[in-house]
């Protein structure tokens, strides 16, 4: 009982339970397909315990197998100007270091305005995850429509 209480007082990071839940801050200009994220208690249901944000991209601090999840809803779904047509694609991948660059998730909106997915994947300390949204006009920043997170599952 005493051990359980002591364990509860330790920060999640020290137990290896790295976790992050982020909300959308902004997109890049047209030629930059990345989504830029923000997180922290001041924003509400958003937090970082272990991983950190580097210029809006999520950087992993502990090796392990992670559950990566994402949902993106488009604010402009049917474009009146069709300046950037569907198919709109969302890709989540390791974008740095370059030696580990790989796509982890790729989704298409097709006729829908929202996509969501998750997968288990090994990640290493120093891996930076990028979320690229191509072909669309604007994703929603509403916190129950667009969010991105990782959860450490096991070594």
């Amino acid at each position: 009982q005493r051990f359980a209480q002591a364990q509860q007082q330790l920060p999640l990071e020290s137990l290896g339970w790295d976790v992050a839940e982020l909300q959308l801050n902004h997109t890049g200009p047209q030629q930059d397909p990345r989504l830029y994220w923000q997180g922290g208690p001041a924003l509400g249901r958003s937090f970082l315990h272990g991983p950190e944000l580097d210029k809006g991209q999520l950087r992993i601090h502990r090796d392990g197998i992670y559950m990566v999840h994402i949902q993106v809803t488009l604010a402009i779904c049917s474009s009146t100007t069709a300046s950037r047509h569907h198919p709109t694609t969302l890709a989540v991948g390791i974008c740095s270091p370059a030696s580990r660059s790989i796509s982890l998730l790729r989704l298409s909106f097709h006729q829908g305005c929202t996509i969501a997915s998750q997968r288990l994947t090994p990640l290493a300390r120093g891996d930076t995850l990028c979320t690229n949204l191509t072909g669309t006009l604007l994703p929603s920043r509403n916190t129950d429509e667009t969010f991105f997170g990782v959860q450490w599952v096991r070594p």
């Epitope: 997109t27 604010a75 402009i76 779904c77 604007l138 920043r141 509403n142």
Partner: antibody, heavy 119, light 118 residues
């Protein structure tokens, strides 16, 4: 044929409130972002507010934040603009338009509804 | 917040070409802005003409003749509306709207240019 029709304009005293409506037809309303733009007498256009297709994301011009609220009822194909604490400088023709104005043009406009704020 | 300016008026002859400018004066680079153009005739609501970010990202309204085209002039830090083969019915007020791409900040309309076809 795409149509948007504003209503709800009128004369209101400074500090008063008014709710504008915009009825849409001829397109799938619940998949399009919508906007409000205004034009003061003899002046240029001023973007007021926009709302995403779902209503989840709203945008406002800085000078209207906190006083104006944009909303939509997708079941009724209707866009709204609730205007509170009105000032004389809010006197304008208010247009409803299809599109967001952010990263895309406003392709279809209504005829506008006149809002006059005067004592 | 972006600030954009238009020359208040412009005159040109039928059949000639005219270049309307939408100059960004807030210190930002026009290259990072989405520009939309609108035409408004007296007593009528605005009419959407075209959208331009780059040659890869542009759109022309279906009812708008190809005489109207959009571009940017990086050296002048301006969005451009080019009208060739000017016709009397082109006489109107023209407005640009500028949105800083990806910023989620409110788009800003320029004050408008009144085009007179002599």
């Amino acid at each position: 044929e795409v149509q948007v029709q504003e209503s709800g304009g009128g004369l209101v005293h400074p500090g008063g409130s008014l709710k504008l409506s915009c009825a849409a037809s001829g397109f799938t309303f619940d998949t399009y972002a919508m906007s409000w733009v205004r034009q003061a007498p003899g002046k240029g256009l001023e973007w007021v507010s926009a709302i995403s297709w779902s209503g989840g994301e709203t945008f406002y011009a800085e000078s209207m934040k906190g006083r104006f609220t944009i909303s939509r009822n997708n079941a009724k194909n209707t866009l709204y603009l609730q205007m509170n604490s009105l000032k004389s400088e809010d006197t304008a023709v208010y247009y409803c338009a299809r599109g967001m104005g952010l990263a895309e043009g406003l392709t279809d406009w209504g005829q506008g509804t006149q809002v006059t704020v005067s004592s | 917040q972006a600030v954009v300016t238009h020359p208040p008026s412009l005159s040109a002859s039928p059949g000639s070409s005219v270049r309307l400018t939408c100059t960004l004066i807030s210190g930002d680079n026009i290259g990072g802005y989405d520009i939309s153009w609108y035409q408004q005739k007296t007593g009528s609501p605005p009419r959407y003409l075209l959208y331009y970010y780059s040659d890869s990202y542009k759109h022309q309204s279906s009812g708008v003749p190809s005489r109207f085209s959009g571009s940017k002039d990086a050296s002048a830090n301006a969005g451009l509306l080019l009208i060739s083969g000017l016709q009397s019915e082109d006489e109107a007020d023209y407005y640009c709207s500028a949105y800083k791409s990806g910023s989620y900040k409110a788009p800003v309309f320029g004050g408008g240019t009144h085009l007179t076809v002599l």
